[in-house]
Interface confidence: low
């Protein structure tokens, strides 16, 4: 998709005269009507396939053609198509005489053409413009011409549609070829794969937008590379997920039976020994003249 | 002419598997997308997903994700749905539809395809 | 997901008067300037047919009278004026997030 552009920049019309000799009367109210078609080896009548368009009175006998892009887009001439441009084509340019305000063909004399010009050749996509003169033996018209691609679409012939986009289908902007120039923090061929946070886990967090990372079951921190032990493990760590290695001093499945009582509750008293035998087991050896479970008697 | 054609009606038993074709002529497959939608008797319109006859990129609905496997085989211009596991839910019309962009839409759509799951 | 709401659940019209169905989204569904609802024609023992595209433009060969209109949440297909062949039932349908979603449908027939 496209636009072909046609900039006209000067028509001479010295005599004031029609393309049968005959002179306008006052002068030559000039304007202009454009078929653009597929290429032809020599230009012959039948549709306009590539489109048409028409201006106003431009001027009378002699004029040149003011940059009206800006003010309605009159000059250049737009000739929009939707296909893939195929790098040639026909262009014919008529200048018609308007004696009144009425435009349509058939409110036209019969004898109302003032010159005919028609050209074909090769013309690649681009911002360049190229100029030509066509004259015959009473007119000549100066005009510059050019293809340019329709937004969203790029490439030799304007066939490669991008269109930026920050979806759920892709989070990119368009290169000057077409190509996809991923938005930061997206990834992939179509920029729909987040890019997790800086050292995230490869295996133990994903992502499903930039900079998050979130952690797959059994994973903790902002990394995701911390596991989480299993539930209730109480004085025990992990290396894997739901583990429960015990800290020295616990044991049992939750780490959570106290191997070393006498350490952490001293519970025998004046001076007594203390000795663990087991889970929260521990006996005291009184010193001599005491007595009791603790030697507290 | 632009076609769609789907494979026959289907009765299958709970828990098997059907896998229902979509042969497409008269436009350039590989240029489109094929959409599959559900239509259960009665009901509205189910999105399940969407495959690229291109490169074969799938996008699902969630809510079908595991339960539905989209194919496609350019040399034949036929897209293919693989339903799995099949229970009476999933009893209904199943209709494929091309695309061209997100912006036109279904355009041209198959007859649809029934699937009755019986025990 | 986005929910569309379609309204009313039937309606019955004269022939040559107008059919308004609206379509409501429970979040907006435009995007940079697009509207990505679509509206379609469903009969009895028939695939659907899409009638319009981006709110508010004809699909191929769709009748002038059926016309679409409406932005961000809100959405209406109007149908003036009513034709026999018109019974059918009609679904709005969004394509802005996946899950692309459908209207419940509204059941339209001749008065």
């Known amino acids: 998709s496209g636009v072909f552009q046609l900039q006209l920049q000067e028509f001479i019309n010295e005599r004031g005269v029609l393309a049968s000799g005959r002179p306008c009367e006052p002068g030559c109210r000039t304007f202009f009507r454009v078929c653009l078609k597929h290429f032809q080896a020599v230009v012959s009548p039948g549709p306009c396939t590539f489109g048409t368009v028409s201006t106003p009175v431009l001027g009378t006998n002699s004029f040149a053609v003011r940059d009206d892009s800006s003010g309605g887009g009159r000059n250049p001439l737009q000739l929009p198509f939707n296909f893939t441009w195929p790098g040639t084509f026909s262009l014919i340019i008529e200048a018609w005489h308007a004696p009144g305000d009425d435009l349509r063909p058939e409110a036209l004399p019969p004898d109302a053409l003032i010159s005919k010009i028609a050209i074909q050749g090769s013309l690649a996509v681009g911002q360049n413009w190229r100029t030509d003169e066509q004259n015959d033996t009473l007119t000549r018209l100066s005009y510059s011409y050019r293809v340019i691609c329709s937004d969203n679409y790029y490439g030799e012939s304007c066939s490669r549609l991008c269109k930026k986009r920050d979806d759920h289908f892709g989070h990119y902007e368009c290169q000057p070829d077409g190509s996809l120039s991923c938005l930061p923090g997206w990834t992939g061929k179509y920029c729909d794969q987040p890019i997790c946070l800086s050292g995230c886990h490869e295996q133990n967090g994903y992502c499903s937008k930039p900079d998050e990372c979130i952690c797959r079951p059994g994973w903790q921190g902002r990394l995701c590379n911390e596991c989480i032990p299993h539930n209730g493990c109480r004085h025990g760590t992990c290396s894997i997920p739901w583990q429960c290695a015990c800290d020295e001093g616990w044991g049992g499945l939750f780490c959570d039976q106290d191997l070393n009582y006498c350490t952490h509750h001293s519970p025998c008293k004046n001076g007594s020994t203390c000795s663990n035998s087991g889970p929260k087991g521990y006996t005291c050896t009184c010193l001599p003249g005491y007595t009791g479970e603790h030697c507290e008697l | 002419e632009v076609q769609l054609q789907q494979s026959g009606p289907e009765l299958v038993k709970t828990g098997a598997s059907v896998k229902i074709s979509c042969k497409a002529s008269g436009y350039s497959f590989t240029a489109y997308y094929i959409h599959w939608v559900k239509q259960s008797h009665g009901k509205s319109l189910e999105w399940i997903g969407y495959i690229s006859c291109y490169n074969g990129a799938t996008n699902y609905n969630q809510k079908f994700k595991g339960k539905a496997t989209f194919t496609v085989d350019t040399s034949s211009s036929t897209a293919f749905m693989q339903f799995n596991s099949l229970t009476s839910e999933d009893s209904a019309v199943y209709y494929c539809?091309?695309?061209?962009?997100?912006?036109?839409?279904?355009?041209?759509w198959g007859q649809g395809t029934s699937v009755t799951v019986s025990s | 997901d986005i929910v569309l709401t379609q309204s009313p659940a039937s309606l019955a019209v004269s022939l040559g008067q107008r059919a308004t169905i609206s379509c409501r989204a429970s979040?907006?569904?435009?995007?940079?300037?697009?509207?990505?609802m679509k509206w379609f024609q469903q009969k009895p023992g028939q695939p659907p047919k899409l009638l319009i595209y981006?709110?508010?433009n004809q699909g191929s060969g769709v009748p002038a009278r059926f016309s679409g209109s409406g932005s961000g949440t809100d959405f209406s297909l109007n149908i003036h004026p009513m034709e026999e062949d018109d019974t059918a039932m009609y679904f709005c349908?969004?394509?802005?997030?996946?899950?692309?979603?459908f209207g419940g449908g509204t059941k339209l027939e001749i008065k």
């Open positions: 539809a091309r695309d061209y962009d997100y912006d036109v839409g279904m355009d041209y």
């Open positions: 349908q969004q394509s802005k997030e996946v899950p692309w979603t």
């Open positions: 981006a709110a508010s």
């Open positions: 979040e907006s569904v435009d995007n940079y300037g697009i509207s990505f």
